[in-house]
């Protein structure tokens, strides 16, 4: 019986996690637990996740008398309520001169003329809307296109007849076609002038350009 009297229920305290021990009888005790803990010795952390309010796809992680949330990349904060500004985090989120616009749960790119796609990395196929004359070949460029004309055709859209086909330039002159109006341009060799390079010139003059 003497050894029994040495037992003091609260010395040392059996209460853990900051619980306070109160002796309720000769051999009994009661633990008053701090918020977030339960059990006869406050040994259990109460699971706060069943009533969680993790937002925007966050996954609940139990804490002590609270909960935390594991957030998807577009959201941050203890409960995933804060939008991540992707435009600050990724200065090069938008390519080819596109402007980054932050949005709740993501971002968008405002692309400059000629580019498209989520990150402005896709060159818009201007040939899809081009009006190159049938038989010509369209070449896509950035925010523009050009038409490669078949023999006998000229102009920006290959819609004009090539005036050089009839060999209007004489005496070995070079013939070029004006892309705007389809007319020929003769670049005369030394000693010749005129629209068709058929006229002689003085010795002092060299290459002449004539349009027709």
């Amino acid at each position: 019986a003497g050894s029994d009297s040495l037992y003091v229920p609260c010395a040392p305290s059996p209460c853990v996690n900051g619980g306070t021990c109160r002796q309720t009888g000769d051999f009994t005790f009661e633990c008053n637990c701090l918020p977030g803990f339960e059990g006869s010795t406050c040994e259990r952390n109460i699971d706060d996740c069943p009533n969680h309010r993790c937002q925007n796809g966050g996954v609940c992680v139990d804490g002590v008398n609270t909960y935390n949330c594991r957030c998807p990349p577009q959201w941050t904060g203890q409960f995933c309520t804060e939008d991540v500004d992707e435009c600050l985090l990724q200065p090069n989120a938008c390519q080819n001169g596109g402007t980054c616009a932050n949005r709740n749960g993501g971002y968008g790119c405002v692309c400059v003329n000629g580019w498209s796609g989520d990150d402005c990395s896709e060159n818009i196929d201007d040939c899809a809307f081009a009006s190159c004359t049938p038989g010509s070949t369209c070449i896509d460029r950035v925010a523009s296109f050009s038409c490669m004309c078949p023999e006998g055709k000229a102009g920006l859209l290959c819609h004009l007849d090539d005036a050089c086909i009839s060999n209007p330039c004489h005496k070995g002159a070079l013939c070029d076609t004006n892309p705007l109006n389809g007319q020929y341009i003769c670049t005369c060799p030394q000693g010749y002038k005129g629209a068709d390079c058929t006229e002689d010139v003085d010795e002092g003059n060299s290459h002449h350009h004539h349009h027709h």
């Epitope: 706060d48 969680h52 309010r53 937002q55 925007n56 996954v59 998807p72 409960f79």
Partner: antibody
């Protein structure tokens, strides 16, 4: 434009059942928590039930006053939330609202409400 | 459950007055608080979320503040269309709970 439209309210006897619907449009339904809130005439707002979003496996929570009597569900293919109400009591008489949880600590879109009257 | 104590339950005010409504929670809700306006026969309308953030389309005369357990809604200069009932609501954990409401009436 975000829209929520409730239907299914009406007069029912105590012990009876009723199923409310909330058809939504203008947003990706599966991304959002959906809440049901009710309001008795001349009284304040009382939360009833919630369905979390797809990221949280559409898990469900109920208020103590309706647990085991009410069932919340959702049909993603129809973008519709439901509240099946069984064993109705006179104290369940209220206007029932469905609302969208904004994901930023607030219910940012509400339906027009549907009146449920439980009376003999 | 988190208890919400909203005060006052009603307030009489004139156009142009500054009106303050408070909401106290029974535990820390980590700024997970929203404020709503409701007019008779209408659905509630979100004014403030996350304790202090103004919902899109809501006039800037409405503002929210607070943290921990104490929160405030302020209407800086009351307008005729502001006469309504205002509710606070905690969104930190389920069950969601609302304050009892504050009716703003014309003096």
């Amino acid at each position: 434009e975000v829209q929520l439209v409730e239907s299914g309210g009406g007069l029912v006897q105590p012990g009876g059942s009723l199923k409310l619907s909330c058809a939504v449009s203008g947003f990706t339904f599966s991304d959002f928590y959906m809440e049901w809130v009710r309001q008795a005439s001349g009284k304040g707002l009382e939360w009833v039930a919630a369905s979390r979003n797809k990221a949280n496996d559409f898990s469900i929570v109920y208020s103590a006053s309706v647990k085991d009597r009410f069932t919340i569900s959702r049909d993603d293919s129809k973008s519709t939330a439901y509240l099946q109400m069984n064993s109705l009591k006179t104290e369940d008489t209220a206007v029932y609202y469905c609302s969208r949880d904004s994901g930023r600590w607030g219910l940012d879109a509400w339906g027009q409400g549907t009146l449920v009257t439980v009376s003999s | 459950d988190i208890q919400m104590t909203q005060s006052p339950s009603s307030v009489s005010a004139s156009v142009g007055d500054r009106v303050t409504i408070t909401c106290q929670t029974s535990e820390d809700i980590y700024s997970g608080l929203a404020w709503y306006q409701q007019k008779p026969g209408k659905s509630p309308k979100l004014l403030i979320y996350g304790a202090s953030r103004l919902q899109d389309g809501v006039p800037s005369r409405f503002s929210g503040s607070g943290s921990g357990t104490d929160y405030t809604l302020t209407i800086s200069s009351l307008q005729p269309e502001d006469f309504a009932t205002y509710y606070c609501q905690q969104g930190f954990k389920y069950p969601l709970t609302f304050g009892g409401g504050t009716k703003v009436e014309i003096k």
